[in-house]
């Protein structure tokens, strides 16, 4: 095992357990965790005499550290007597020590709450010459506190004779105050009102506030499509940096590996928005081996403006795999928009929630601005849905009437892509789309779990998800069918099936 | 309250340098850059450049690279300005600014100081 | 860089008026635009920031408003002390430039 130092602990018992004519008493000191031995404990025992007995060292089972007890006994007037141990550790290091100073016993007591108050800005939320610092030391059990100043760690040389205390009943309340000029309260050093009470520490820091609320600088950290990942693999994540003050580019954004491999070369790109604020993004292309084999990557975000750099990582989801179900659908012809149709696609149950879409047209795939896809929403098993809606064109169907919706997702076998094709006008039973008219739509209760309309053909309708009764001037069953699903709080999304 | 106070006003000959400062107080000094205004009599309002107090980083004008450096003593919360080899267009009032936090304006700007250069 | 193009360059005004000053941007510089006071002898003093945003402590008497790259100022009544030189400035790209200026004299 390696050196090791000792933590030291004071042994009392509480005074209440004292008989109140004991002439002797006895106390302790605990030093524990070190090693190697020995420890040499010492006592200060002021004007008493004491006689001290240290027990033999004993190993600690797990660390195979080492523990010891130092019992000083001491007669006489020791009730207001304050007691010093001193615990060297020579093999930590030459002068290595720690005292202890405490009484006899300790006091059932409420301790002190801390709190520093600081005087207001002036009308013109500017700082005045001085600025006042005020310790509130309140609600404790009556007892001799002592109240010490610290400038960034430093002790202050503060005259506390100003120091009041008052009593509200059995607890008592003190107030310290600090005066700081303006300068050195600009200076951005941390003030702290340290209270030593009942051998305890308690305190409260302050510092002055940021100048302007850098109205909550956010950073986020995406991770590679699986588009990206597996079908061009090229992964890219981005680190975004959204509402910062723009300070003319001195935000700095530094990527590096969990792994302390070094990083390829990223891409940085600034955009100033209508709200005054600068929008910052980092690209870092990624290695799809590194990636899958589960390296993480962080962003560290720095700027005049946050009081300590932003830290955000990324890595490869872990958790449970489930492969997407694709389900491609068209709408029927509404009036007065011949020309054009919706096709939506349903992809769903799929883990973890990383998913690429994307639109196919005669083997050529549709630019990502042509669909519009939702953003991955749990489902109420454990896996997650998207929407995705393309708009096709009379003159695209008529050129192929084939359009494919395809999923990229990791869990999909072989290739890590699932695809529906989807037509606009399949050839159905009882005329095509656009010569009939559409059917009532069908709000679909499911209980437990939404109903889906089949994609085939002359298939029947999932059995949670009835059709309507369709119309007088509808010819014979409804063969199309709008499945509703009313989500609590939300627009309704709806999708169109055959039934 | 925000101020920024510059040194005063400095005659100098063609081909001297100087050096003008600008010290700020009543804010965190290295929460903001500073940026360097000049105004030659008469006329508008010429940007020269921008100093980070929190890191140091500097950007100048096209026009004035290579013959200014601005630097920054955060012990003491001073912009400096330093313009070498003068030449008679120089001759100009020299204005630090505060850059402000959202748009980038020139919030706070020192009083001025007078620069002549004159053989 | 991009130029800023201020108009009038001059104008006379009487105390009361309404005194309208434009400022047209030689590219898309969105609403980062801003507007300053400088009065003889003295440092400018911002007005505007964000084309419409009034620093805090100016009169209200004195807004901003954009129109795609053609901005405003406006002084709803003109105040004895308003007569002086204003200038816009453009700080959506390095370096910033300033308009040329417009002088408000007294008529």
């Known amino acids: 095992a390696s050196t090791q130092s000792p933590s030291v602990f004071p042994l009392t018992r509480c005074c209440k357990n004292i008989p109140s004519n004991a002439t002797s008493v006895t106390l302790g000191c605990l030093a524990t965790g070190y090693f190697p031995e020995p420890v040499m404990v010492t006592w200060d025992t002021g004007s008493l005499n004491g006689t001290t007995m240290t027990l033999p060292a004993t190993t600690l089972t797990l660390s195979g550290h080492y523990a010891t007890i130092s019992l000083l006994t001491v007669s006489g007037a020791w009730a207001k007597q304050m007691f010093t141990c001193r615990v060297a550790h020579t093999p930590s290091s030459t002068d290595w020590v720690d005292n202890k100073t405490f009484s006899v016993c300790s006091r059932d007591f409420t301790p002190p709450t801390v709190k520093i108050l600081q005087s207001s800005c002036d009308g013109g939320g500017h700082f005045p010459p001085t600025i006042q610092l005020l310790c509130l030391v309140s609600g404790y059990t009556p007892g001799t506190i002592n109240i010490t100043w610290l400038e960034d760690g430093q002790v202050m040389d503060v005259d506390l004779s100003t120091a009041s205390t008052t009593q509200e009943g059995e607890l008592a309340s003190t107030q310290s105050e600090l005066t700081l000029s303006q300068k050195h309260w600009l200076s951005d050093r941390t003030y702290t009102c340290q209270v030593t009470y009942q051998g305890h520490t308690f305190e409260d820091s302050t510092k002055k506030c940021a100048d302007s609320n850098p109205r909550g600088v956010s950073a986020y950290l995406s991770r590679p499509s699986p588009f990206d990942l597996f079908i061009r693999k090229s992964p890219t994540i981005t680190c975004l940096v959204v509402d910062l003050a723009p300070s003319k580019g001195t935000v700095n954004l530094t990527w590096s590996r969990a792994s302390g491999k070094p990083v390829n070369h990223s891409t940085r790109k600034e955009e100033k928005q209508r709200n005054g604020t600068l929008t910052v993004t980092s690209t870092l292309p990624v290695g799809t081996r590194d990636w899958i084999e589960g390296e993480t990557y962080q962003c560290r975000v720095t700027h005049p403006h946050l009081p300590r750099a932003l830290m955000r990582s990324t890595t490869k989801t872990s958790g449970p795999r489930a492969a997407p179900e694709v389900y491609a659908f068209a709408t029927p012809e509404w009036p007065g928009s011949r020309d054009k149709r919706t096709l939506a696609c349903l992809i769903q149950n799929f883990m973890p929630e990383d998913i690429s879409v994307q639109w196919l047209h005669n083997e050529v795939q549709l630019p990502d601005a042509r669909h519009s896809t939702t953003q991955p929403r749990k489902t109420k098993g454990s896996g997650f849905f998207v929407f995705s809606r393309l708009e096709v064109t009379r003159a695209e169907w008529e050129q192929k009437d084939e359009f494919i919706c395809r999923a990229v997702h990791e869990a999909a076998s072989p290739s890590q892509t699932v695809q529906r094709a989807v037509s606009v006008n399949p050839g159905l039973a009882g005329g095509s789309a656009q010569s009939q008219r559409a059917p009532d739509r069908v709000l679909c209760h499911s209980g437990q779990q939404q109903g889906l309309p089949r994609a085939a053909g002359g298939s029947v309708p999932h059995p949670r998800c009835h059709c309507g009764a369709g119309r007088a001037d509808w010819p014979g069953p409804p063969e199309l069918d709008v499945c509703v699903e009313e989500a609590e709080g939300e627009a309704p999304w709806t999708w169109t099936g055959l039934c | 309250q925000v101020q920024l106070v510059q040194s005063g006003a400095e005659v100098k000959k063609p081909g001297a340098s100087v050096k003008v400062s600008c010290k700020a107080s009543g804010y965190t000094f290295t929460s903001y850059g500073i940026s360097w205004v000049r105004q030659a009599p008469g006329q508008g309002l010429e940007w020269m450049g921008w100093?980070?107090?929190?890191?140091?980083?500097?950007n100048y004008a096209q026009k004035l690279q290579g013959r200014i450096t601005m630097t920054t003593d955060t012990s003491t919360s001073t912009a400096y300005m330093e313009l070498r080899s003068l030449r008679s267009d120089d001759t100009a009032v020299y204005y630090c600014?505060?850059?402000?936090?959202?748009?980038?304006?020139?919030?706070?700007w020192g009083q001025g100081t007078l620069v002549t250069v004159s053989s | 860089d991009i130029q800023m193009t201020q108009s009038p360059s001059s104008l006379s005004a009487s105390v009361g008026d309404r005194v309208t000053i434009t400022c047209r941007a030689s590219q898309s510089i969105s609403n980062w635009l801003n507007w300053y006071q400088q009065k003889p002898g003295k440092a400018p003093k911002l007005l505007i920031y964000g084309a419409s945003s009034l620093k805090s402590g100016v009169p209200s008497r004195f807004s901003g408003s954009e129109s795609g790259t053609d901005f405003t100022l406006t002084i709803s009544s003109l105040q004895p002390e308003d007569f002086a030189t204003y200038y816009c400035?453009?700080?959506?790209?390095?370096?910033?430039?300033f308009g040329q200026g417009t002088k408000v004299e007294i008529k």
């Open positions: 100093i980070s107090a929190y890191n140091g980083n500097t």
């Open positions: 600014a505060r850059d402000g936090d959202y748009y980038d304006p020139f919030d706070y």
């Open positions: 400035q453009q700080s959506y790209s390095t370096p910033p430039t």
